[in-house]
Each structure stands twice: as C-alpha cells, then as structure tokens.
Interface confidence: low
Amino acid sequence: VPDKTVRWCAVSEHEATKCQSFRDHMKSVIPSDGPSVACVKKASYLDCIRAIAANEADAVTLDAGLVYDAYLAPNNLKPVVAEFYGSKEDPQTFYYAVAVVKKDSGFQMNQLRGKKSCHTGLGRSAGWNIPIGLLYCDLPEPRKPLEKAVANFFSGSCAPCADGTDFPQLCQLCPGCGCSTLNQYFGYSGAFKCLKDGAGDVAFVKHSTIFENLANKADRDQYELLCLDNTRKPVDEYKDCHLAQVPSHTVVARSMGGKEDLIWELLNQAQEHFGKDKSKEFQLFSSPHGKDLLFKDSAHGFLKVPPRMDAKMYLGYEYVTAIRNLREGTCPEAPTDECKPVKWCALSHHERLKCDEWSVNSVGKIECVSAETTEDCIAKIMNGEADAMSLDGGFVYIAGKCGLVPVLAENYNKSDNCEDTPEAGYFAIAVVKKSASDLTWDNLKGKKSCHTAVGRTAGWNIPMGLLYNKINHCRFDEFFSEGCAPGSKKDSSLCKLCMGSGLNLCEPNNKEGYYGYTGAFRCLVEKGDVAFVKHQTVPQNTGGKNPDPWAKNLNEKDYELLCLDGTRKPVEEYANCHLARAPNHAVVTRKDKEACVHKILRQQQHLFGSNVTDCSGNFCLFRSETKDLLFRDDTVCLAKLHDRNTYEKYLGEEYVKAVGNLRKCSTSSLLEACTFRRP
C-alpha cells in the first residue's frame, strides 16, 4: 500500500460498498501522487478501533461515546477531523446536553432528588448517559442495577426503552416506556413535551431541542437551564450553562504516526469534490443503501481538529466525567459536602519541590501534579488531572478561553483588609541600563530584548501588543536583533540570549535561568539592552535584596524606565512611566472546583501566608528566594474577587482586547484548541 493511502475502516457490507465507491471516485479526481483510499472491513466499531491501534487501518468516524473508547489505553487514538453541521459560515461541530426546567419551579441541579424526570431514551447521550453519569455519585446505593438507582433517585420518570416490568417508576410518566415515536414522550421532542405538559419537572435534551419545539421567544422565556454550578440561565445561554459539550461525529486516528495531515488532506479534497451539492454521481454525505454510512448524512463538511487536542480535551471534562462514572462506577468515599484535596499544578522541578513541601505541611489538603509548561498545566486542570494554579494575566486569558475561572487574586500591597480588596493591578515596565543613555521607546529596533516568557503580561502581551500597533506585523524576532523570550521557537533569535543548557534552553519554566521576572532582569544585567518586567522587579533584585551572585551588588540607581512618550525616568517613578497596568496574577480552576479551591486556599494562607514571620524554619507559601515559585514572592495575600469572577471581568475589557489583537501573532496551540471548542 503506497505511503499516501488512508485505510478507511468500514463496519458493514453497506459501508464497505460505499467505501469502495468513495475510493474509486477519489481516484478519478485526485492526481496519482495525491492521497488515496483503501477499504478495510471489520465487524464492529470496536474492532475498527483495535485495527487502527494495531496499524491495520488508519481512520474511522465515531460518535462521542466511541471516541472515549478509542482514547482509552491500549487504543490511544485521537480525534483528527470533525464533521460539521449547519452552514460553512457558522459550522457546528458540537451539541450541548442540557437540563431544561420551567421558569417558576425554583430548584437547582443539586436539588434534583425527588423530582420527576424526562429522558429522550435509556442509554442515549444527552437524555441519559450524560445527566445520569454526572448525577451518578448522588444516586442512592447500591448503584447497580443503574435503572433501579435512578428510579429511587427521581420520584417518577419517563425513560423510553427502559424495562417497565422491572423498573415501573422509569415508565411512570409515559406508561409502557415505548421505544419509538409511538410513545409521545420519546426522543428529544418527546422529552421536552413531557416537561411542557407538566408530567415532569426536568427534561434532559440537547440545546437545539427548545428552539426546534418553540419558535416563539416569549414561549422559550418560560423555560430555563439548570447549570452545574447550581444556578439557572436563560435557554439561549446554553454555551455557559450545560451538562456537557459533546462532539457530534469525529474521525479518529493513531496518536503517533497516525497520518493526520494525510487524512485531513484526503477529506478536505473529498468534500470539495463530493461534499454537499457538489456531485451527482457520488455524495460523501448521503447513504442510498442505508443511513449514516461512513459519515452522518446530515453533515455539511469537515473541519480539522487542532493538533494540540487530545480526546480528553476534545470530549471535555464534563462528558469524560459522566462516561467514566457510568463505565467505572466508582465514587469518592468522602461525603460530598467535604472538599477533596486540591491538586496543585507545579511547573518543572523547582516548583515541584516547593509544592511537595506545601503538601506535607498542609496535612493532605494539597496534592501536587507536575507539568513542563504553563499550557500543559492548564490542560491538566481542564481534564481533571490537576485542579488549580496561580497564573499571570496572559495565561488567565488562555485558561479563561479554555473554560477555567479565576477564584482568588494575588495582592501585592499590605493593607488591613487585604483578603477583601483585590487590587487594580501592577505596572508593566521597560527597564534599561542608565549607562545606555541614548536608548528610548522609539529606537528599540535592533536592540537585545529580555522577556519573562511568551504569552505573559508584562513580559510579552503588553510590550509586544504596543509594538504590534506600531510595526503592524508579528515578526518580533526581526525587530529585535536577539533576545530571550522563553517559549519562543528554539531556532528563533528570541532564544539566542537565553542561558538554559541543552533542552532547557528557552523553556518557559525555571530550568531556563532567564525565565520569569527575575530571569528577564538578570538577562538585562548580563546580556540585554531592555527588559520587560513588572514595576517591583528592579527594587526586589537590587540593594542586596537578592543574594544570588549575579544580583548581590546591583544598585537600583543604575537602571531607568522607558516611557511611551520617548522619555526616561528613574525606577521609582513607575506610576508616571509604564507601558500599561497589568491585572494581578490569579488562581484559576474548573468551575466545579471553584468553591473548594476558594475554601482550602483561604485556610492555607491563614496557616502559611505572610503572617508567618520566620521563613527559615517554617513553610512560607509566598516565598521562594525571588524565584516566584507557585506564587509571586511579593504576594501579601490571596484576595476574593467579588463579582470579577470570569476571565473577562477579571482581566478587564481593555486587556482582553489587547490580548485579542495580539492573537494573530499567537503561537499558542492550546488557545487554538480551546477556540475550536468555543470559537
């Protein structure tokens, strides 16, 4: 089989026939050196998944539940192409599983016990697997058989396709539990009708069901959605209030050597030649001898899944949790009103050492999880491998786009009610050596630059955003002659000044000596012309405050700030000479962990915060010899956010806009993946 062949897996005679037709028609329109199709027939989707894992086939299209199976070891497959529905201009690749209730019913998600429930059908995604999977650990024990546990949880249900003899309560609202449209409460519209008629209190459906059944907005306004955080939202806010976001139909391939570019090229060409309304003789999204053969008949085209996206990220935390609960049937032993340990994400070796020390001192309240980059940490928090970390504003933006929320803000000024008053922010500045007297904001071109890291606020987003507005392109590595911006491509001139050895060179963690505020300032001291840092960096590392050999003899007076008007000022005049105000670093987590992270961190800072006077003999949460490990070293406390509890509100409109503008220069693969799930 030639190298450019994609071996498609078919699961029935009819699919195999369509696959052969697909193969032959592709041959007729694609040059001989282009991608081609070969067909492999297997007895089931699970056999196809195993065949792909064993390199006997390359691709198959799966529903979300099977994408989960495909991802599990030893299969280790990943999503590579998504089918989309709707229009090319507004492609829909996901649907949202929602819980719909009547507006005046007054209960929340955590008060569903004893209510009457309407389901689309037993074993169906939005109507059963997702809601029951998410409620699984609230079900009364024994939880097996599942139908019995569900019947004992709700006071009555309509769950079409259930066994009405063994589980009569599941058929209480729709006598007989008929498994077809003969049952008026069957399917999406039926479950909604069950709610509408007043038979049930809650209907588990998908987001479009309400719109398909109620054309009139005034009618829709009589209903609300239950959110997982025990609030309610209007039905049109389903993107912010759903049980899970579920991919409709996805092509999977091997994670390693999976031909993902070739599969995309093949399908992209296929949809151009044989997509919707393209060809009479063969149609990709049509199944004359069956239904949904190879691809869904309702699909309109394909979108490439960003390479950073693994199956866990693609399926989303809620969906994976629901399916895992149903499949594995395990629940934590702790009572649900007690917080489980918070899994803190630590970057590389140095942070892990501090985190382990914190974990021991916290007596089990904090556990540690390691990752090599901030983006890897954010991904781990998204998928539940970790729970929280403190982030610079630039990463709060990425985390927010990935569905995480800020819970507490670092405060840097001493005040009586520190924990109740989140600060307005710190200043992003440009520092130069006083001796380089001709250097100004207007003549930085060709100079040597030092940055905290790519994507961070003071070190990158603010200065590069301002620069972008001036030069109108993203070639910052050409603007500066060389520099150190950890997180840049290794062969970039913006890694040339970095000091990390071997693989650690230019890495965005503490293994790179010029990483972070202190690292960027050290880069200026030793090699650079300008450093982009925060206003406290120079005083914190001069006058003997940093005992490291490179810093111990430094004097604040030997450095000056560049002002945007082309002038220069002493370091202490940062309030009148800065690039912008930056939002303070903030702790982020998943929405479902918000309350527990808030509670545990407030306990932890009372034990190990700035009230600890002797850090030589005791653990101090906000100290790490100017290395800003886990938190910034100048943190005085972690403050409540009050109503600034989303990434947009926390960062502020101006900063969100600035980072948004800089997104065209973004190299963040995580941001690309998260905007695929939530454009």
Epitope: P91, Q269, E272
Partner: nanobody
Framework: EVQLVESGGGLVQPGGSLRLSCAAS????????MGWFRQAPGKGLEGVAV????????YYADSVKGRFTISEDNSKNTVYLQMNSLRAEDTAVYYC?????????????????????WGQGTLVTVSS
Amino acid sequence: EVQLVESGGGLVQPGGSLRLSCAASGHAYGGNYMGWFRQAPGKGLEGVAVLYTGGGSTYYADSVKGRFTISEDNSKNTVYLQMNSLRAEDTAVYYCALALGSARWYTSSLDARAYNIWGQGTLVTVSS
C-alpha cells in the same frame, strides 16, 4: 514570523508564458495550503491555484485548468505558478497566500478566507 515574497510578474503578449515564484520563510514548510490568488482591476479576489505543501495535491480554478501549473521546490520553500497560453482576462495582481493554523479549517482550499498570510502581490499584464 512568516513572510511570503513573490516575483516574476510583468508584461506579456496574449498566448505567451510567465512563471511566478513565491518564497516562504519563517515557518516549518510542509503540511499547509499555499497558492495563488488574483485580483483583476475592479473585481474581487479569485482563487487561481493551490497546493498542499510537502508533496500534496493541487487544485485549480476552472478558468485556468490546462493552462496554469502550480508546483513546489521543497528545498527552497518555494511555490511556482507556470502560466501558459495567457489571455487578456488573466491580467491582474497575483498574490501568493498561505493558510496556517486555524485558517485551514475553511472547507475550500480556493477560498481566500482560509488564508491568513499574504504576499505583497505582483502585477501580470497580458496585452498586445
């Protein structure tokens, strides 16, 4: 940062030939759509020819099929457009473009919206 530099435009008589070049720098070459678009005076942007870089397939607008050939030299990160049997209606500014990252999610490889990196353009005039 990625840059595209076009060359090879000029004045040519009807029936004549021209070869346009587009050199890409600043990104990992291969595995992206790259190709040629044109804009005639007073008209919109039209996809001409595109290939999937690194040995992939080619796509042509119906109006140029059989006359224009798109090719690449991997070692030079360069894409070429060989234009034969030129006609007056081929007169336009020809732009080289590259679809990087999420831009590749558009469905048609000849859809200008799919391309996020553009060259400055080179003028091709076909006139006797």
